[in-house]
Interface confidence: low
């Protein structure tokens, strides 16, 4: 059986991607449950899972609340069975998150290529705008909406026929690109926001060709 | 009672990705289990994967960190791994697994309850 | 990495005798993560015990397990024919989850 020793959180790691903010820690549990509290800097704590067994906790619907601001996280430890119960100094052990500040550090998901048009020697290719969980009067917002013109696509195309790749940039969610008459492209998309020092770059969306379906060609 | 059943194909080539995907019967996937992928390379001992917990979070062998992707499906009640630019050497029968946390007496303990029968991957070209 | 070293590589036993297995942790481990599995050829290993010391659901009495910190011990009281099988330590505490190199029980 347990005992009733109970041990602090250690590991305490944010994992975020377009603002879902998952903050994740060490060990599972033995003898113990833990609740997390998080806060802004100037802010009170705010308690969520509250004695869970769980080694993480889902704090989006906090930090979506203002996504530039910095949060601090905390996991308390409770003795399994005995959560009035705290630790010899009178209070529960508890173990400090690194600060995370929405807008600057959540990783920026996939994108994903919503269409692509060819209208002769010219190809139109638009990204889809992804929907963040961050709200503004009951809407969710995409992430061109939060992030603005802080946010950039790269777009990677190359001839189905070869290897070389070009590079378009935009601070839209649109390609306007040259290419030659009669030749099918492939596609890749890559989010960036440049004046991040972390996570800059999102993984390269799926690779969409031209000849299938997702794409229209019209010739002109 | 809950099962799990491996699939996926028998036979990939090097340096191509190995897919594989767990269905979880006979119970729900976000009952508040791990689900675990574990490999056994032929005639030898047993080397565990990674894991994932209904909500997405993951913990991965750090030995193998680099080229897997443990997912998760709840509507389908399954998850999958994902294991990239594959080897000779990632031949071995997968299985998944359930890792079960169990409250008795005041403590937690955990252990891997439920496995499935187990499907063998050969990488070959 | 917690590395798990089971002794002896390969038990040769009569049917009736008492089989004692051991399995040595690195480091020390918590006996709540601590479990034993029987595998036997072309199936899936099948749990014994848990908690160090916890026998699973329709698992026989014959079948115990002891110890803490570092080393832990499977005991089978009596061989049964059907117990002939590799039997496998595992701790699922600290990641990498790691299995012992398994212990072989053989007909002698």
């Known amino acids: 059986s347990g005992t009733t020793n109970t041990v602090a959180a250690y590991n305490l790691t944010w994992k975020s991607t377009n603002f879902k903010t998952i903050l994740e820690w060490e060990p599972k549990p033995v003898n113990q449950v833990y609740t997390v509290q998080i806060s802004t800097k100037s802010g009170d704590w705010k308690s969520k899972c509250f004695y869970t067994t769980d080694t993480e906790c889902d704090l989006t619907d906090e930090i979506v609340k203002d996504v530039k601001q910095t949060y601090l996280a905390r996991v308390f430890s409770y003795p399994a069975g005995n959560v009035e119960s705290t630790g010899s100094a009178g209070e529960p052990l508890y173990e400090n998150s690194p600060e995370f500040t929405p807008y600057l550090e959540t990783n920026l998901g996939q994108p994903t290529i919503q269409s692509f048009e060819q209208v002769g020697t010219k190809v139109n290719v638009t990204v889809e705008d992804e929907r963040t969980l961050v709200r503004r009067n009951n809407t969710f917002l995409s992430l061109r909406d939060v992030f603005g013109k802080d946010l950039i696509y790269t777009l990677y195309y190359w001839k189905s026929s070869s290897s070389g790749k070009k590079t378009a940039k935009t601070n839209t969610n649109e390609f306007l690109i040259d290419v030659d008459k009669g030749e099918n492209y492939c596609f890749s998309v890559q989010a960036v926001i440049p004046s991040r020092t972390v996570n800059r770059k999102s993984t390269d969306s799926p690779v969409e060709c031209m000849g299938q379906e997702k794409g229209e060609f019209r010739e002109i | 009672q809950v099962q799990l059943q491996e699939s996926g194909p028998g036979l990939v080539k090097p340096s191509q990705t190995l897919s594989l995907t767990c269905t979880v019967s006979?119970?729900?996937?976000?009952?508040?289990?791990?689900w675990s992928w574990i490999r056994q390379h032929p005639g030898k001992g047993l080397e565990w994967i990674g894991e994932?917990?209904?909500?997405?979070?993951?913990r991965y062998n750090p030995s193998l960190k680099s080229r897997v992707t443990i997912s998760v499906d709840t509507s389908k009640d399954q998850f999958s791994l994902k294991l990239s630019s594959v080897t000779a050497a990632d031949t071995a029968v997968y299985y998944c697994?359930?890792?079960?946390?169990?409250?008795?007496?005041?403590?937690?303990?955990?252990?891997?309850?439920?496995w499935g029968k187990g499907t063998t991957v050969t990488v070959s070209s | 990495e917690i590395v798990l070293t089971q002794s002896p590589g390969t038990l040769s036993l009569s049917p009736g005798e008492r089989a004692t297995l051991s399995c040595r942790a690195s480091?020390?481990?918590?006996?709540?993560?601590l479990a034993w599995y029987q595998q036997k050829p072309g199936q899936a290993p099948r749990l014994l015990i848990y908690g160090a010391s916890s026998r699973a659901t329709g698992i026989p009495d014959r079948f115990s397990g002891s110890g803490s910190g570092t080393d832990f011990t499977l005991t089978i009281s009596r061989l049964e024919p059907e117990d002939f099988a590799v039997y496998y330590c595992q701790q699922v505490g600290v990641v990498p989850y790691t299995f012992g190199g398994g212990t072989k029980v053989e007909i002698k």
């Open positions: 006979g119970g729900s996937i976000s009952s508040g289990q791990y």
């Open positions: 697994a359930r890792d079960t946390p169990y409250y008795y007496d005041g403590g937690y303990y955990y252990y891997m309850d439920v």
């Open positions: 994932i917990y209904y909500s997405g979070s993951t």
């Open positions: 480091q020390s481990v918590s006996s709540s993560y």
